[in-house]
Amino acid sequence: TEVKVIQPEKSVSVAAGDSTVLNCTLTSLLPVGPIRWYRGVGQSRQLIYSFTTEHFPRVTNVSDATKRSNLDFSIRISNVTPEDAGTYYCVKFQRGSPDTEIQSGGGTEVYVLAK
C-alpha cells in the first residue's frame, strides 16, 4: 500500500511572535527517502525544514525523528512573523538522484494575527 502523508489541520492561526505546530504523520517510512516541509507549491515553493539536515533557525521537529520507527514529522515554527503566512506542505520523497516526490500532505494554511 502506498504511503500516505496526513496533515490533519487545514488551517491554524497564530499571533505574531508566538510559535505554532504544524502536524504531519506518515502511514509508512517506505519507500526510504527524505521528508521535507515546504511553503507554497510549484517552482517557487520554499523549503522550510528538512529532516535530513540541521540549521533551520526558527523551525524544529516536534518528536524525536531519530527513532527508527518514527512516523511523526510535525514541526514547530517559533517567533512567527507576518511573512510566515501561507500554506505549508509536508512532502515525502523516494530516494534517488535526484530524490522524487511521491506524496504530499493536503497542506496547512497558516494565518498570522497581529499582536
Partner: antibody, heavy 118, light 107 residues
C-alpha cells in the same frame, strides 16, 4: 571537529561484564542517534546496537539482545554499552559511531579493544 | 546479507568500481566505509547512497539502483589502498548490516 573517544575496554574472563563508554564532542550530541559497531580480529564490521537521540528507543542485533544494553546520558554527551556474560566470541575492537538522518554512520571513534580470555 | 568482491586492484589514475548487492532499493540505504588497517577507525567516504562528507576527496562517489550500490574512485591514488566495507540500513527491519569488505590494492 566531531570527536568520539571510546574507553572501558580491557581483558576480562568469560562470564564477566564490562561497560564501554564513548565521549562525544564537537557536535550537538542530543540531536543524533548513535550506534555501537565491533570488529573481531581478522573479521569485518558488525553492527550491535543503536539508540535514538532522546534515548527512549533502542535497537539490537539478535545475537546480543538481552545480553548487551545501549544507553546514553545527553547531559554528559556520553554513550554506553553494558556487556554481560561475555564469551571469547565477544573479543573485538568496539567502535561508537554517529548516525546520519537515515541511520548510516558518518563519524567513528578510534575504538576500544575488549579481550575475553580465561 | 550484503555481498561485495573480496579484492580489486588498479593502477594509479585508473577508475575503480566496487559493487555491493543484496539490499532492497525500496527499503535500504547504502554507505561506504574505508579502513586502512585492521582495528583502525573506519572513515565514511559515502553515505546515503551518494553523499560525500565534506572532508572526503571528490574522486570518491557513489550510486545505487535496483538491489546494488557502487563505490567509484575516479583517478585512484596509492593512499586509497584500504579495505572498503559497504554498509546498509534497512528501513523495514531497522537493522544495519555490512558487507565482508573489499581489499583495494593500488599497483
Amino acid at each position: 571537529d566531531v570527536q568520539l573517544v571510546e574507553s572501558g575496554g580491557g581483558v576480562v574472563r568469560p562470564g564477566e561484564s564490562l561497560r564501554l563508554s564513548c565521549a562525544a564532542s564537537g557536535f550537538t550530541f542530543s540531536s543524533h542517534a548513535m550506534s555501537w559497531v565491533r570488529q573481531a580480529p581478522g573479521k569485518g564490521l558488525e553492527w550491535l546496537a543503536g539508540i535514538s537521540a532522546g534515548g527512549s528507543d533502542t535497537y539490537y542485533i539478535d545475537s546480543v539482545k538481552g545480553r548487551f544494553t545501549i544507553s546514553r546520558d545527553n547531559s554528559k554527551s556520553s554513550l554506553y554499552l553494558r556487556m554481560n556474560s561475555l564469551t571469547a566470541e565477544d573479543t573485538a575492537v568496539y567502535y561508537c559511531a554517529r548516525e546520519t538522518w537515515n541511520h548510516l554512520f558518518d563519524y567513528w571513534g578510534l575504538g576500544t579493544l575488549v579481550t575475553v580470555s580465561s | 546479507a550484503l555481498t561485495q568482491p573480496a579484492s580489486v586492484s588498479a593502477n594509479p589514475g585508473e577508475t575503480v568500481k566496487i559493487t555491493c548487492s543484496g539490499g532492497d532499493y525500496y527499503s535500504t540505504y547504502y554507505a561506504w566505509y574505508q579502513q586502512k588497517s585492521p582495528g583502525s577507525a573506519p572513515v565514511t567516504v559515502i553515505h546515503s547512497d551518494d553523499e560525500r562528507p565534506s572532508d572526503i576527496p571528490s574522486r570518491f562517489s557513489g550510486s545505487a539502483s535496483g538491489s546494488a550500490a557502487t563505490l567509484i574512485i575516479t583517478g585512484v591514488r596509492v593512499e586509497d589502498e584500504a579495505v572498503y566495507f559497504c554498509g546498509g540500513y534497512d528501513g523495514r527491519t531497522y537493522i544495519n548490516t555490512f558487507g565482508a569488505g573489499t581489499t583495494l590494492t593500488v599497483l
